[in-house]
């Protein structure tokens, strides 16, 4: 079963991963995150569904000067176990 507290954030260069993480911690208390091995997407778990929904609302937003970020519900069940 999918857990609605998880979102997937993608579209950033590897070098900007920690900066993007800082930005997404503004939307709620992150409990944990899982980084892809190439560093350009991550799964983020928030403390609540409401916080996750707030992060989802940032889909398509530009961060920094030119980083357009995608945010979608996480569908990777393996990270939720």
């Amino acid at each position: 079963q999918l857990d609605d507290t998880w979102v997937t954030v993608f579209g950033f260069p590897q070098a900007s991963a920690s900066y993007i993480l800082l930005q997404f911690a503004q939307y709620g208390n992150i409990i944990k995150h899982v980084m892809s091995n190439n560093g350009n997407w991550m799964h983020i778990q928030y403390q609540s569904k409401l916080q996750a929904r707030k992060a989802l609302s940032k889909d398509g937003r530009i961060f920094g000067e030119s980083i357009m970020i995608g945010v979608k519900p996480c569908i990777d069940k393996s990270v939720m176990e």
Epitope: A17, S18, Y19, L21, L22, A25, N29, I30, I31, K32, H33, V34, M35, S36, N37
Partner: nanobody, 120 residues
Framework: QVQLVESGGGLVQAGGSLRLSCVGT????????MAWYRQAAGKEREVVAG???????HYADSVKGRFTISRDNAKNTVYLQMNSLQPEDTGVYCC??????????????WGQGTRVTVSS
């Protein structure tokens, strides 16, 4: 399990300074990122300053040139030096530390916050 305890908040007049400290009860010297956030009454949380992976720093535009974030690995502490404080800096300041627990998996730890009030 890491716990974070902030201190150093208080009431200060505009133009004054404060130094916030965030001490980790566990080892936070290997943190992936360390940051300070603030939340003013009725407003959303905002990132104030962060030490990014690799050691570079990030500051909110509103605090650049006034605030400085630093870390002391030997003391498991992250600091926020705040100078030229303005009433708009009032809020609860919260510490956030991210630590890699296993490969590609990171745990997040949050402090309870310390209140900063800047009077005009």
């Amino acid at each position: 399990q890491v716990q974070l305890v902030e201190s150093g908040g208080g009431l200060v007049q505009a133009g004054g300074s404060l130094r916030l400290s965030c001490v980790g009860t566990g080892n936070i010297s290997s943190a992936y990122t360390m940051a300070w956030y603030r939340q003013a009454a009725g407003k959303e949380r905002e990132v104030v300053a962060g030490i990014l992976n690799g050691g570079s720093t990030h500051y909110a535009d509103s605090v650049k040139g006034r605030f400085t974030i630093s870390r002391d690995n030997a003391k498991n502490t992250v600091y926020l030096q705040m100078n030229s404080l303005q009433p708009e800096d009032t809020g609860v300041y919260c510490c956030h530390v991210v630590i890699e627990s296993t490969r590609f998996v990171y745990d997040h730890y949050w402090g309870q916050g310390t209140r900063v009030t800047v009077s005009s």
